[in-house]
Interface confidence: medium
């Protein structure tokens, strides 16, 4: 019995078909992706294949002006338009709390959706109770399959899930869901989850009984051959694990941002064993046409979008890299032009002794989420900056102990080369790294910008001095592991939308052009 | 509120086809499946198959596969079904029903008012 | 294809009573089962899915339960307006068949 798996996972929010890099498409012929192209390939290959499920691993929401408008309510109709069996929770689900995922998504999605491991309690388990559900038996043809769904466990460190959910070890969690499936004689399963390729594989090695992994959340690229596009395989497609006991659990995902569809063709025998398995994400590319029906449900739900998308703000004339593969690495150009923003935004309380309140800013790498391509014109719209900083977050201002920051910076590299989002970009402050210490020994100078001086010029910092510093609420909350800001901080005041922010700094500037200029080294 | 309206009744003759509208209002036509299933007098329902509007993916019973043609026209929100080669055990009410497929737990949640086709000669 | 065989095909009960009808499945459909209500001259009517959830609207003495291949549709206390023929549906492998039926008259 044959079973075609159809895959995608961390779509973020990329309603639209988008650029080769998953920014806004500028050249309609050379876009990418979107539901409307998603579509087309589901129905074509659902014609052609008697036994296909479309599953979704996590990661709907957040990504662009789509969501910061219709909060995923955008998100449960194109996917109910796409027939989606399936999907699990992902981290960023929780991103505008417990009720932004519960009214939205979880009552309007005529899919189950799923997560093994987040127990609720407290008053939010009857809330809840049925919204989403540890796995579901779907029919498939003349068979049933088993889909049972895990998320994240970082996802308190990483969103907004509130203290009523407990997000318990993805292993420890799925083995009895797993068990109950057998017992319900229940064959063929597939784990199905965000929590990386690493836990992905973890669980393909250790839960005893699942037969397919399909994952997310660490935007993992597989291919077998030669990748159609710019990414760069990270393995084999599927990914082969053998379990403890002995069997070849094929692991997949789909990169990210609908950019790809994955395509895996599983054969079972009679007692739900896998024999065989082979396939390769889907580059959906211009030669796929978009549905006509899918994409003029998306114009008409633009229309709302209209106000945020149009609007020039100011120019850029050069490119603002805010490539993953740029800011959490190093120093990015538009990781400079947000910090420069925040510290504009907070020019206030001089006097003869200070020039300003605050000159340093801090930003998780991972927090920049998009490039805008200067070649657009130059322009730049709120759109373009909804895809930067997606997360509708506040940029706000601490106070802190020197000794923090410095635990912080120490933070920002102890896992470095990892794609991680801890990496910190910044303003007002010069640091110099030696990966080649030992993590937590790796910040050999960090000199800040002083504020009370006439012209500002950097000095070391001081462990025991307490220093203002502008950042977003997310670091200011503990997020992306900074657990020191949190739990060190002195003081912290709320501060303006981040988008908004960065947009009254360019309109007031007009014409920008940040560069690279050795804030990092 | 939410309702499907079909055709009124029709006669034919054995080897004719007939074609029975189902004009649905008060949804998003496009979004839910229409199912169309028949029951012959004093018997009961025989499911015919169905049709998803938005892109016209059909999926029939295999007994009618061959005869029936399910089609839609999203601009009036209209599903079609035709039966050709028609014979006297034809003879029955036929009913459109929308298909809900919340969570993934299927069910006939709107149904129309049904439209009788009389088979004889 | 899966059968539906419903029992008993008609059943006479008075108001008050409390009811039970059967339906068993040829093979295991796995609670994907709806229940439905038909008065003469009218369309089928909704009242149960996924083999004991109650359709919304649908008064709370109708409640159903099983699994795997027997399902029973159960009326708790029997009023006027509740007799009618009740049919069960599966929606696990196309083609979804129905039951054939159980036609509830006044005793």
């Known amino acids: 019995w044959e079973l075609t798996i159809l895959h995608t996972n961390d779509v973020h929010s990329r309603l639209e078909q988008t650029s080769e890099d998953s920014s806004k498409c500028v050249n309609a012929s050379r876009c990418m992706g979107g539901v409307a192209r998603l579509f087309t390939k589901v129905q074509q290959i659902r014609r052609a294949e008697p036994n296909v499920l479309l599953l979704d691993a996590g990661d709907q929401y957040q990504g662009t002006i789509w969501f910061t408008v219709y909060k995923g309510a955008e998100v449960a109709h194109f996917m109910n338009a796409l027939r989606y069996d399936a999907m699990a929770l992902g981290n960023h689900e929780f991103d505008n709390g417990v009720e932004g995922l519960i009214e939205p998504l979880l009552k309007e999605a005529k899919f189950p959706i799923l997560s093994a491991n987040i127990k609720a309690k407290g008053p939010l388990a009857s809330q809840i109770s049925g919204l989403y559900l540890p796995y579901k038996v779907l029919p498939v043809g003349d068979e049933v399959v088993g889909i049972v769904g895990y998320t994240s466990k970082e996802t308190p460190f990483l969103s907004n899930p509130g203290t009523n959910l407990v997000f318990e070890d993805e292993i420890t969690a799925l083995q009895p869901e797993v068990d109950k499936l057998k017992t319900l004689n229940v064959n063929k399963i597939i784990a199905l989850g965000h929590s990386g390729f690493e836990t992905d594989k973890l669980i393909a090695q250790k839960v005893r009984g699942v037969d397919v992994v399909v994952g997310g959340h660490s935007n993992t690229f597989l291919y077998t051959g030669n990748p159609p596009s710019k990414e760069v395989p990270a393995g084999k497609y599927p990914f082969i694990v053998t379990s403890d006991d002995g069997r070849k659990v094929p692991v997949v995902q789909a990169y990210a941002f609908g950019k790809y569809l994955g395509y895996l063709k599983i054969e079972f025998d009679e007692r739900g064993n896998v024999i065989s398995s082979h396939g390769n994400p889907i580059l959906l590319n211009s030669s796929i046409p978009e549905d006509p029906s899918i994409k003029a449900d998306i114009n008409k739900w633009r229309i709302k979008l209209d106000n945020y998308s149009t609007q020039e703000l100011g120019k850029t004339i050069v490119y603002l890299d805010g490539s993953s593969q740029s800011c959490r690495f190093r120093e990015c150009n538009m990781g400079n032009l947000i910090c420069d923003a925040m510290i504009n935004n907070n020019l206030r309380h001089a006097d003869e002794m200070f020039w300003n309140h605050v000159s340093m800013c801090i930003l998780n790498g991972g927090g920049i989420r998009s490039p805008i391509d200067e070649r657009n014109n130059g322009t730049i719209t709120w759109e373009n900056l909804a895809a930067v900083l997606p997360f509708g977050g506040t940029f706000d201002l601490v106070q802190l102990k020197g000794s923090t920051l410095k635990k912080a910076f120490e933070h920002s590299v102890h896992r470095y080369g990892q794609s991680t989002g801890e990496f910190l970009q910044v303003g007002g402050i010069h640091v110099v790294y030696d990966l080649s210490r030992k993590p937590g020994d790796r910040v050999v100078k960090l000199d800040v910008l002083c504020t009370k001086c006439r012209v500002p010029s950097y000095d070391p910092l001081k462990m025991d001095e307490i220093y203002k510093v502008i950042l977003p609420n997310f670091l200011a909350n503990g997020g992306d592991g900074f657990q020191m800001i949190k739990d060190e901080l002195l003081r912290h005041d709320s501060g303006d939308q981040d988008i908004n922010v960065v947009s009254t700094y360019i309109s007031k500037m007009k014409v920008i052009y940040p560069a690279v200029e050795g804030r990092i080294k | 509120q939410v309702q499907l309206v079909q055709s009124g009744a029709e006669v034919k003759k054995p080897g004719a086809s007939v074609k029975v509208s189902c004009k649905a209002s008060?949804?998003?036509?496009?979004?839910?499946?229409i199912n169309w299933v028949r029951q012959a007098t004093g018997q009961g329902l025989e499911w015919i198959g169905w049709i998803y509007p938005r892109d016209g993916f059909t999926k029939y019973n295999e007994k009618f596969k061959g005869r029936v043609t399910l089609t839609v026209n999203t601009s009036i929100s209209t599903a079609y079904m035709e039966l050709s080669s028609l014979r006297s055990e034809d003879t029955a009410v036929y009913y459109c029903?929308?298909?809900?497929?919340?969570?993934?737990?299927?069910?006939?949640?709107?149904w129309g008012q049904g439209t009788t086709v009389t088979v004889s000669s | 294809d899966i059968q539906m065989t419903q029992s008993p095909s008609s059943l006479s009960a008075s108001v008050g009573d409390r009811v039970t009808i059967t339906c068993r499945a040829s093979?295991?459909?796995?609670?994907?089962l709806a229940w439905y209500q038909q008065k003469p001259g009218k369309a089928p009517k909704l009242l149960l899915y996924n083999a004991k959830t109650l359709a919304s609207g649908v008064p709370s003495r109708f409640s159903g339960s099983g699994s795997g291949t027997d399902y029973t549709l159960t009326i708790s206390s029997l009023q006027p307006e509740d007799f009618a023929t009740y049919y069960c549906q599966h929606f696990w492998s196309t083609p979804w068949t129905f039951g054939g039926g159980t036609e509830l008259e006044i005793k």
């Open positions: 029903a929308r298909k809900e497929g919340y969570r993934g737990d299927w069910y006939f949640d709107v």
């Open positions: 093979g295991n459909v796995h609670n994907y």
């Open positions: 008060g949804y998003t036509f496009t979004s839910y499946d």
